[in-house]
Amino acid sequence: FVRTKIDTTENLLNTEVHSSPAQRWSMQVPPEVSAEAGDAAVLPCTFTHPHRHYDGPLTAIWRAGEPYAGPQVFRCAAARGSELCQTALSLHGRFRLLGNPRRNDLSLRVERLALADDRRYFCRVEFAGDVHDRYESRHGVRLHVTAAPRIVNISVLPSPAHAFRALCTAEGEPPPALAWSGPALGNSLAAVRSPREGHGHLVTAELPALTHDGRYTCTAANSLGRSEASVYLFRFHGASG
């Protein structure tokens, strides 16, 4: 097809002859992909480019966090004419190329997902040889990792005036609701701290004053499940008289 651009004075500016509608750089990635921790996810990425029938050397790259500057988590290179993209980098051995870059597909499989993988990922392709060109997705794909609650720490700590307090920290996505139960407590959603900076999936609940000996149980729950852990408080009571 032929696309003609005309300026306001009706002068012919330029005429571009296109053999197909895909003769420009573009990348197609979904805004977000969701998967459960421990499972696998696929980060889809396909692209179009202006270099017809390019079969020279190419490199496929995925980075995390931010475009252009974020750390690479995967890289592979295909030699001239080769359909095989030889993996050169796979962070922790968990990133695997599903797509065929020769067919404009850079889709990536991420295995054994962890909550720390919850971030944005950016695909990039580089052509070398006769043609030198490169393109990277600007907005990337957000990998949203969900997880059932897991209590990562539960402890009893001394507090002023010979008292004791209990802390329970759990992780999960969505962030779990924490509840304490124990002697003379019933069920209380005590003093939940907001997720800490840089630890968005961690939630802490404090029980400020343990007034009775016995078992104190912390329960963490979200839409994917629940988890429980307990601590025991037994104070030494000296003989009187």
Partner: antibody, heavy 121, light 111 residues
Framework: EVQVVESGGGLVQPGGSLRLSCATS????????MNWVRQAPGKGLEWVAQ??????????FYAESLEGRFTISRDNSKSTVYLQMNSLRAEDTAVYYC????????????WGQGTLVTVSS | DIVLTQSPDSLAVSLGERATINCRAS??????????IHWYQQKPGQPPKLLIY???NLASGIPARFSGSGSGTDFTLTISSLQAEDVATYYC?????????FGQGTKVEIK
Amino acid sequence: EVQVVESGGGLVQPGGSLRLSCATSGFNFNDYFMNWVRQAPGKGLEWVAQIRNKIYTYATFYAESLEGRFTISRDNSKSTVYLQMNSLRAEDTAVYYCTRSLTGGDYFDYWGQGTLVTVSS
Amino acid sequence: DIVLTQSPDSLAVSLGERATINCRASQSVTISGYSFIHWYQQKPGQPPKLLIYRASNLASGIPARFSGSGSGTDFTLTISSLQAEDVATYYCQQSRKSPWTFGQGTKVEIK
């Protein structure tokens, strides 16, 4: 031309051991994952084990029922993969196939002719 | 483990006719549009041969009369016009989750 050739099969008594070898040629061995798949006489296919390549830290994976008895390994300098089988049982009797898979896909694009392992007293 | 169930167990089709084999997974094997189901052909006395990978991609050197389709839990292998050399047992395999598992096989014969 891709070639995958298994050897080391034979008759072994229950409780015995056997080491299978798989020699490959015609492709860059270092670029691929290697697997063993078995087929009991007249039965279907069962995946046994996988070993990944250097980039993927030579990670190994096993069918749950076999883990602890079978060990997969590879020698890149010889383009060869091995399956060490210990504490063999009658139900391990099968043709053992060595297969190749791409780093991006756990499907088996080349298969050897297989080697028969018979566990019997 | 993901269980794959093939149907039918055996199939007799006239030469030139269409043969259809189904494979049902016990849970979804599709992620973000990628289906981790693969099909193999095994002739008597030979090792299996890859026909279709990731549900619908024809493996190298395989005739175009073979095709695959499906998503989620239900997949189909179709031989559009059965030839004498297609007599074999066909297996599906999943790589969605380890351990990789196979269907029990479907034997295709000439009617």
